[in-house]
Interface confidence: low
């Protein structure tokens, strides 16, 4: 399927001009390659009429141009002074030859309709209203006024001043006069439909002295706006229907043969196919609203329509706006899994993609709520503090320049199941949707912290240990201190080479954190976690309370009297042959660890990925003088 997109059908009238926009995928090659417009002949050949290389055919000389807009990946063909000879099949495309990527466009140029010379033309959109002005001479002021619609043979009454109204115009047509002006009457017709288009005659008086005026009413379907979006990206339908429908229910529907199936409306209806990835947002009191859809799929391509009606459903004669959405499968947005699985008490690490060219953009994570019109309150962001109800169990790790940031949620409950969105304040196309599924845990968690009821005593030494299974052996372990601005990874030192995972003793794998001496600032949430290179895995959390020493409590001496370190982290292993430890002080990485791509660890992903990268894990210590090594046998 060609990734080039444009209008399928373009119509105009003789002497007018058209402007045809064609879209192409966002690549530098496409931005700079030749763009062309050619006419298809009976033989299948497509003859170039104009190209971005400067070629212009004789028949287009002086009346056409082609402009490339590389910044929004479109090019526009403008053609003026149209004649009926311009009717035909065309292609807009990219490439050095006319056999490159292209899109078929049908252009139809009609004759200007012949109307009586005094005809007044009114052009209105479907669903809107028209006020027809009917002047008359003063002597016809007392006479009957009327408006009729011309049919083949006769003129069928619409409305007259005796309050006679054609049944199909009841409630829609009004005949009135303004103020004291006795030389003009008006007919207003509301909720216009295609059937209302045609020739009308307004008349005041009877017989040869009657005043008559010819009126041509054209009722147009709105021209669909073209939207070109990448697979997995997001789209916003901005709907502006006008003040007259400000208080009506709003909807967005997708054309399906003859009907338009409602996808979402402001009365709470929502198509299950869009669950978790759609919001409808009223913009203001003027009838404006927008619908945002994330995680675009191939099957989302098509013809969309927004409208307003008290039923929240499409109704003939009510204003509409339309779009043609094209979903480009050559997407720049990486294919990540859209469902992440976790278990109660466990954790998930979610990789959120963003446009790598916007590494400095602010990153956010929000939870999609389906009630009402749908909304997505932000739970955490690079400059947004974690929401209170997620205290101690949610953090966002930003890796500038990489194109991925990571959100970790632990202490999972079944309440956490639902849809979440990754978004930034930059390129809105990169909004992505994740469905989090949480199953009841059927086994012990992979990471376990002891002691579980952690109360540290002020001024003393306090150690917590994080036990991990052998399958995490080759991965880095870390402790971090959680705050509502993130989880501050505690610096580490290299523990040196380790035993091979073949001889891993399931009962003795642990990484410990020592607070020495304990201070009041140490109180709070701490996480123990695993990661492989730039990929975060499981985490578990513990709250450490800090209390004053009560009488009778024993004073615990620090393991190393010279230790200046506030926190020492140790990798505890069975192999006592590891005697030489090289301590490496790592500069503080700031409030967020600079980690890159991440996959969720709630299902099998972790096991599939834990390959034997032995010797790469970091033990952790705040200063080079602190070494606490406990060997368990």
């Amino acid at each position: 399927k060609s990734p080039i997109f444009g209008p399928q059908e373009v119509s105009s009238i003789e002497g007018d001009s058209v402007s045809i926009t064609c879209y192409y995928p966002d690549t530098s090659v496409n931005r700079h390659t030749r763009k062309y417009w050619c006419r298809q002949g009976a033989s299948g050949m497509c003859t170039t009429l104009i190209s971005s290389n400067g070629y212009l055919s004789k028949e287009y000389s002086g009346r056409a141009n082609l402009i490339n807009f590389p910044e929004n990946n479109t090019f526009v063909i403008n053609i003026e002074q149209l004649t009926q000879d311009d009717t035909g099949s065309y292609k807009c495309g990219l490439g050095t030859s006319n056999r490159g990527l292209s899109f078929d466009v049908s252009l139809e140029v009609s004759q200007v309709p012949e109307l009586p010379s005094d005809t007044h033309v009114y052009t209105k959109d479907i669903g809107r209203n028209v006020t027809i002005e009917c002047p008359f001479k003063r002597e016809n002021a007392p006479s009957k006024k009327s408006l009729c619609k011309k049919t083949n043979q006769s003129c069928e009454l619409v409305i007259d001043s005796t309050e006679k109204v054609n049944p199909s115009y009841i409630g829609r047509a009004k005949l009135f006069m303004k103020g004291t002006d006795l030389t003009v009457f008006y007919v207003n017709i509301s909720h216009l439909t295609h059937n209302d288009a045609g020739l009308y005659i307004c008349q005041a008086g009877e017989g040869p002295s009657a005043d008559k005026k010819n009126v041509d009413l054209q009722v147009l379907a709105p021209e669909p706006e073209l939207l070109y979006k990448d697979l997995r990206s997001s789209v916003t339908f901005e709907c502006d229907l006008g003040r007259e429908v400000a208080n009506e229910a709003k909807y967005l529907c997708r054309m399906n043969k003859e009907t338009c199936d409602v996808i979402i409306n402001t009365l709470g209806k929502r198509d299950p196919d869009f669950e978790g990835r759609i919001l409808i947002t009223p913009k203001d009191d003027n009838g404006r609203f927008s619908v945002l859809i994330t995680g675009l799929r191939k099957e989302d391509a098509g013809h969309y329509q927004c409208g307003a009606h008290s039923s929240g459903l499409p109704q003939e004669g009510w204003p509409i706006q339309t779009w043609q959405l094209f979903v480009n499968e050559e997407s720049t947005i990486p294919n990540r899994r859209s469902v992440v699985k976790g278990v109660t008490g466990g954790s998930v690490a979610i990789a959120c993609p963003y446009n790598p060219k916007e590494s400095s953009s602010l990153k956010y994570w929000c939870r999609w709520e389906g009630d009402g019109n749908g909304h997505c309150p932000v739970l955490v962001g690079t400059q947004a503090q974690v929401q209170e109800e997620y205290e101690g169990r949610l953090a966002l790790f930003d890796q500038p320049g990489n194109g991925t940031y990571t959100v970790i949620l632990n202490q999972l409950t079944t309440e956490d199941a639902g849809f979440y969105w990754c978004l930034t304040n930059g390129d809105s196309r990169w909004r992505t949707t994740i469905e989090l599924q949480v199953a009841e845990a059927t086994r012990e968690p992979n990471l376990e912290v002891t002691p579980q009821n952690a109360t540290a005593v002020l001024g003393e030494t306090f150690t917590v240990s994080c036990h991990y299974p052998c399958k995490f052996y080759s991965q880095e372990k870390y402790w971090c201190k959680w705050s509502n601005k993130g989880c501050h990874i505690l610096p580490s030192h290299d523990e040196g080479a380790r035993q091979s995972s073949v001889s891993c003793d399931q009962s003795s794998q642990l990484v410990s954190m020592t607070l020495n001496p304990v201070s009041k600032e140490d109180e709070g949430w701490y996480w123990c976690g695993v990661k492989q290179g730039q990929t975060y895995g499981e985490t578990t959390a513990i709250y450490i309370a800090v209390e004053e020493r009560t009488r009778g409590s024993s004073h615990v001496n620090p393991t190393d009297a010279n230790a200046r370190a506030k926190v020492a982290l140790e990798e505890e292993v069975v192999d006592s042959s590891i005697s030489e430890k090289e301590n490496k002080a790592i500069p503080n990485p700031g409030p967020f660890a600079n980690e890159r791509e991440i996959q969720n660890v709630g299902d099998q992903a972790q096991e599939n990925r834990a390959s034997g990268d032995a010797g790469s894990a970091d033990g952790q210590s705040r200063s080079s003088s602190s070494k606490h090594h406990h060997h368990h046998h």
């Epitope: 530098s28 978004l423 304040n425 930059g426 390129d427």
Partner: nanobody, 121 residues
Framework: EVQLVESGGGLVQPGGQLRLSCAAS????????MAWYRQAPGKQRGLVAI???????HYADSVKGRFTISRDNAKNTVYLQMNSLEPEDTAAYYC???????????????WGRGTLVTVSS
């Protein structure tokens, strides 16, 4: 809001040179493409040069080899060095930038008010 302010236009003789500057200011979160367009009297506005999001540059055929576009990302500023100017280069030069603001997700096109370049002897 975002403002783009062009400067550096003026009257110059054929064969001469000028350097245009355009600075973007306001509540800017991120700037993607920055470009120069021009519009000669009675003609449509056309692309002169673009400094694309990936750092690539692109020039209209008529200015290749004579004009150079450059950019200072830290200052959100784009420059157009115009050498060997010809009378056909006479036009209003407009700066264009795709900008994401702090308060609105997504990029939008912003335009400057233009600076006039006249090449005449």
């Amino acid at each position: 809001e975002v403002q783009l302010v062009e400067s550096g236009g003026g009257l110059v003789q054929p064969g001469g040179q000028l350097r245009l500057s355009c600075a973007a200011s306001g509540s800017i979160a991120s700037v993607r493409d920055m470009a120069w367009y021009r519009q000669a009297p009675g003609k449509q506005r056309g692309l002169v040069a673009i400094f694309a999001r990936g750092g690539t540059t692109h020039y209209a055929d008529s200015v290749k080899g004579r004009f150079t576009i450059s950019r200072d990302n830290a200052k959100n500023t784009v420059y157009l060095q115009m050498n060997s100017l010809e009378p056909e280069d006479t036009a209003a030069y407009y700066c264009n930038a795709e900008v994401a603001t702090m308060f609105q997700p997504g990029f939008r096109d912003y335009w400057g008010r233009g600076t006039l370049v006249t090449v005449s002897s």
